[in-house]
């Protein structure tokens, strides 16, 4: 509950406000209750963090967040007698971290990371303006199913790009999702200042490309089933089929947000398949479909990344140009 | 075969604004930085801003901050120099160069003039 | 800024001799230097990065070597096509910056 009753007098500051880091970007927070409590006053602690972000009113005497240490980040902690957001708390005590020392200009940009198909991570940076062309680099990266940090050993460059990339496969745990990877890339010198990100695990996903199956014709209607990238359930998926007809030059894109196998002409009961009519097209011509997926936002934050085209297939005749 | 092509120089008063394109060819566009570089007769070969390869991070010299803006099109593989605030001493041929691995430029368009004169 | 100095600004040569061009830096650059050649009305051409390693397509008679604030651009033996201006540039630092230029000229 609310505790006993709330004195008027101003509680005394809590002591010993102390911060450390776990991992590679979990901050806490840890403190010691007021000296001189009120003894019929029980204990609340108001939080929050520089910004006046995130306020908070709780029992306990830690806090921790999860935030890229790119820069100086502080959590101010005052005691109370009650849950009350308009009770004065005591004096604000304030502790702060800073990122790890070094030249912001030699720090990597653009850290970021995509998750492949639910299989693998691949982060990619691009070397700060004030940084020695020759400078190695190491990621290392966290996971809450992982029992220590780990260092990223497939490193590669791509044009002015670095990156690297590790295996990160979906577990069974429901709440596996829920957590967000750890990032942080340094060089092996220990010259450039340190880069951080954080990368929940319903953003930034691509699916691998699906796999045409059939591909079949019912009056001038085509009928496209496919196969989803494993990993993913249809549902969770948005579609792009897209077909190209040779006479006429035809391109037609079909956004598809649903795409089930109900109807009669589709092979039925075959796992993980998806399903599409394209109306009005000539079977009496050669027509070539490919088809993209990405996730979709019942399942994921994010649904910005397509996959890449799945293998053409055709159907029909290529007429004889005369 | 790498290829640069620069364009959009011409005469303009001062205060006035004018904006450069560059379109490049022969190679992965995305992956890498693409700047502009001036020259002038009296104070030579001079760097004036740049854009990684996805545009998100931009650099400038000082000489032009605040009145320079770059961006970059990967669909169209161009990039465009917007300058505002023209003065007297922005009057320079401007290439537009592809970066190398790192800050040196391997790849040159042919040049723009831009001309600031009332 | 990074400052590099060049010398000398101008030289006159003839065809077949070595030319050698000195490149010196306002702090030790590593080995981050490029050289280019420039043509009249023409755009620079790359030649020579990390001090020493040749552009694709470069003649074998361009070499560099240095380190730190010495560098040196040889011609080992002068070609007809090769009378243009030479810069030098650090990229050690941002931002990256040029050699005032050498003139190289016909005896």
């Known amino acids: 509950g609310g505790g006993g009753a709330a004195p008027t007098e101003t509680q005394p500051p809590v002591t010993n406000l102390s911060v450390s880091v776990e991992n590679l970007c979990t901050v806490i927070w840890t403190w010691n209750p007021p000296e001189g409590a009120s003894s019929n006053c029980s204990l609340w602690y108001f939080s929050h963090f520089g910004d006046k972000q995130d306020k908070k009113i709780a029992p306990e005497t830690r806090r921790s967040i999860e935030v890229p240490l790119n820069e100086r980040i502080c959590l101010q902690v005052g005691s109370q007698c009650s849950t009350n957001e308009s009770e004065k708390p005591s004096i604000l005590v304030e502790k702060c971290i800073s990122p790890p020392e070094g030249d912001p200009e030699s720090a990597v940009t653009e850290l970021q990371c995509i998750w492949h198909n639910l299989s693998y991570m691949k982060c990619s940076w691009l070397p700060g303006r004030n940084t020695s062309p020759d400078t190695n680099y190491t990621l290392y990266y966290w996971h809450r199913s992982l029992e220590k940090i780990h260092q990223c050993e497939n490193i590669f460059r791509e044009g002015q790009y670095f990156g690297c990339s590790f295996d990160l496969t979906k577990v069974k745990d429901s709440s596996f999702e829920q957590h967000s990877v750890q990032i942080m890339v340094k060089d092996n010198a220990g010259k450039i200042k340190p880069s951080f990100n954080i990368v929940p695990l319903t953003s930034r996903v691509k699916p691998d490309p699906p796999h045409i199956k059939n591909l079949s014709f019912h009056n001038d209607d085509l009928y496209v089933q496919w196969e989803n990238p494993q990993n993913f359930i249809s549902r969770c998926l948005f579609y792009e089929v897209e077909v190209n007809n040779s006479q006429t030059e035809t391109h037609n894109v079909f956004y598809v947000q649903e795409a089930k196998c109900e109807n009669p002409e589709f092979e039925r009961n075959v796992e993980n398949t998806s399903c599409f009519m394209v109306p009005g097209v000539l079977p009496d011509t050669l027509n070539t479909v490919r088809i993209r997926v990405k996730t979709n936002k019942l399942c994921y934050e994010d649904d910005k990344l397509w996959s890449n085209w799945s293998q053409e297939m055709s159907i029909g005749k290529k007429r004889n140009s005369t | 075969e790498v290829q640069v092509l620069d364009s959009g120089g011409g005469l303009v008063q001062p205060g006035g604004s004018l904006r450069l394109s560059c379109t490049a060819s022969?190679?992965?566009?995305?992956?890498?930085?693409m700047s502009w570089v001036r020259q002038t007769p009296g104070r030579g070969l001079e760097w004036v801003s740049g854009?990684?390869?996805?545009?998100?991070?931009?650099y400038f010299a000082d000489s032009v901050k605040g009145r320079f803006t770059i961006s970059r099109d990967n669909s169209k593989n161009t990039v465009y120099l917007q300058m505002n605030s023209l003065r007297a001493e922005d009057t320079a041929v401007y290439y537009c160069?592809?970066?190398?691995?790192?800050?040196?430029?391997?790849?040159w368009g042919q040049g723009t003039l831009v001309i600031v004169s009332s | 800024d990074i400052q590099m100095t060049q010398s000398p600004s101008s030289l006159s040569a003839s065809v077949g001799d070595r030319v050698t061009i000195t490149c010196r830096a306002s702090?030790?650059?590593?080995?981050?230097l490029a050289w280019y050649q420039q043509k009249p009305e023409k755009a620079p051409k790359s030649l020579i990065y990390?001090?020493?390693s040749l552009q694709s397509g470069v003649p074998s008679r361009f070499s560099g070597s240095g380190s730190g604030t010495d560098f040196t651009l040889t011609i080992s033996s002068l070609q007809p096509e090769d009378f243009a201006t030479y810069y030098c540039?650090?990229?050690?630092?941002?931002?990256?910056?040029f050699g005032q230029g050498t003139k190289l000229e016909i005896k």
């Open positions: 160069a592809k970066e190398g691995d790192w800050i040196y430029f391997d790849s």
């Open positions: 022969g190679f992965t566009f995305r992956l890498y930085t």
């Open positions: 854009i990684s390869g996805s545009g998100l991070s931009t």
């Open positions: 702090q030790g650059i590593s080995s981050w």
């Open positions: 990390a001090a020493s």
């Open positions: 540039q650090q990229y050690n630092s941002h931002p990256p910056t």
